[in-house]
């Protein structure tokens, strides 16, 4: 007889996770001389150690720290860039801009960036039918558990001057429930960090409003501003140009807005 | 807030070169421009170039290509402008100015002025 | 590379008394977003520039409202209302539109 599987909301572990994880750590540390020391099955064992067996809506940090140890990285600290709900213009402007880093960029952003993953209680296996989805069903799921604990690691690496990208297209260009207005935010060190320069991706072609003096970003001035944190804000006009520029800074069509 | 300090007077023999320093305090420095302008005694402003220190490649004027090099040092939140092959015309006060508008990528607006250095270019 | 021209190049003025500056570009500051790319500063003695107006017609922070800006395209204005001892100085406009920035030649207000 079959045993009965728990139905979650959300869609289940992307196929072939294991081989997926595997490879990208193999290829990062083949990138990046300074992970070569990485033993890629012992992540791969920590990886799958912090869910596997485990109830899938009672994952903690703490399941996660063996492979946070084995994932300890360190980035330039003044040379991190934040974004929320615009991660394709954050990382392409990361691979242009080498020297400034997305949490994707590093090993434990780059292994699980766009994967999902979640076992079963008391069993070894891997859940690819479903798996919790954050608000219909949990928040303490596999996923969700993972990206607060390297987010917050993130921030709390970050000096100096922290950047973020926001995407002005949506009504909410700060958004307090985002994993950036959730986690990061509140995990920046004061004490560190001087200020927040916050980006603002204009959508419209024509469109000159200074979103910077939207509430929501007025509200995320007034956050960090209690945390005794500098605030600042850039319009970015021409999401397309503003990347050709970063390519090409001397072009002369770049010394106008974008 | 923002502070913009230049380095002092300068002396120079045609021929020489003269690099100005203009160090930044209080607020961002990194994707603000900084530009530099001259004044010649008794003169106008002239737009040199500039530069926005996260990307750390400069734009120079047509006139002054080949001549100068805009740098910055975002560690000591630092621009530099080096003029080379001087001449008795380069007799000027050199101003740091860095833009102040919430506009990514604007050379202009410059709400902060250095104190202004003057390099004097005489044999 | 956009030619800024100004007029006139000596301005008397008497306090309380309005003045107007004019400056013309050799091609049109207005782009396709809508702003004019034209910047107002003065020059007092002995100091640095200091912005006073910026597309076309904003007020820096700080600058009294005696100052007003107006124009576009290629002919613009500066105005101030009431002439105060403390605004003599050289008076520029620049263009912000494309490279090289340039400045016009300056006017020069000065007590009568």
């Known amino acids: 007889v079959p045993r009965w599987r728990q139905q979650w909301s959300g869609p289940g572990t992307t196929k072939r996770f294991p081989e997926t994880v595997l490879a990208r750590c193999v290829k990062y540390t083949e990138i990046h001389p300074e992970m070569r020391h990485v033993d890629c099955q012992s992540v791969w064992d920590a990886f799958k150690g912090a869910f596997i067996s485990k109830h899938p809506c009672n994952i903690t940090e703490e399941d996660y720290q063996p492979l946070m140890k084995l994932g300890t990285q360190t980035v330039p600290c003044n040379k991190i860039l934040l974004w929320s709900r615009i991660k394709d213009l954050a990382h392409q402007f990361t691979q242009v801009q080498r020297d400034m880093f997305t949490l994707e960029d590093t090993l434990l952003g780059y292994l699980a960036d766009d994967l999902t993953w979640c076992g079963e209680f008391n069993t070894s296996k891997i859940n690819y039918q479903s798996c919790p989805d954050w608000r219909k069903d949990c928040s303490n799921n596999p996923v969700s558990v993972f990206w607060k604990t390297v987010s917050r690691r993130f921030a709390e690496a970050a000096c100096d001057v922290v950047h973020v990208m926001l995407n002005g297209s949506r009504s909410k260009i700060f958004d307090k429930n985002s994993t950036f207005g959730s986690v990061e935010v509140h995990n920046l060190q004061p004490e560190k960090v001087q200020t927040l320069e916050a980006w603002v991706i204009h959508g419209g072609r024509e469109d000159s409003r200074d979103l910077c003096q939207d509430p929501t970003i007025k509200e995320l001035e007034s956050i960090i501003s209690k945390r005794n944190i500098q605030f600042s804000c850039k319009n970015i006009y021409r999401p397309d140009k503003f990347l050709q520029c970063v390519k090409n800074p001397e072009d002369s069509s770049c010394t106008s807005e974008i | 807030q923002v502070q913009l300090v230049q380095s002092g007077a300068e002396v120079k023999k045609p021929g020489s070169s003269v690099k100005v320093s203009c160090k930044a305090s209080?607020?961002?420095?990194?994707?603000?421009?900084i530009s530099w302008v001259r004044q010649a005694p008794g003169q106008g402003l002239e737009w040199m170039g500039g530069?926005?220190?996260?990307?750390?490649?400069?734009n120079y004027a047509q006139k002054f290509q080949g001549r100068v090099t805009i740098t910055a040092d975002e560690s000591t939140s630092t621009a530099y402008m080096e003029l080379s092959s001087l001449r008795s015309e380069d007799t000027a006060v050199y101003y740091c100015a860095r833009d102040s508008s919430s506009w990514y990528f604007t050379y202009g607006y410059f709400q902060h002025w250095g104190q202004g250095t003057l390099v004097t270019v005489s044999s | 590379d956009v030619v800024m021209t100004q007029s006139p190049l000596s301005l008397p003025v008497t306090p309380g008394e309005p003045a107007s500056i004019s400056c013309r570009s050799s091609q049109s500051l207005l782009n396709s977003n809508g702003y004019n790319y034209l910047e107002w500063y003065v020059q007092k003695p002995g100091q640095s520039p200091q912005l006073l107006i910026f597309l076309g017609s904003n007020r820096a922070s700080g600058v009294p409202d005696r100052f007003s800006g107006s124009g576009s395209g290629t002919d613009f204005t500066l105005k101030i209302n009431r002439v105060e001892a403390e605004d003599v100085g050289v008076y520029y406009c620049?263009?912000?539109?494309?490279?090289?920035?340039?400045f016009g030649g300056g006017t020069k207000v000065e007590i009568k």
């Open positions: 209080g607020g961002t420095f990194s994707s603000y421009a």
């Open positions: 530069i926005i220190p996260i990307f750390g490649t400069a």
């Open positions: 620049m263009q912000a539109l494309q490279s090289p920035l340039t």
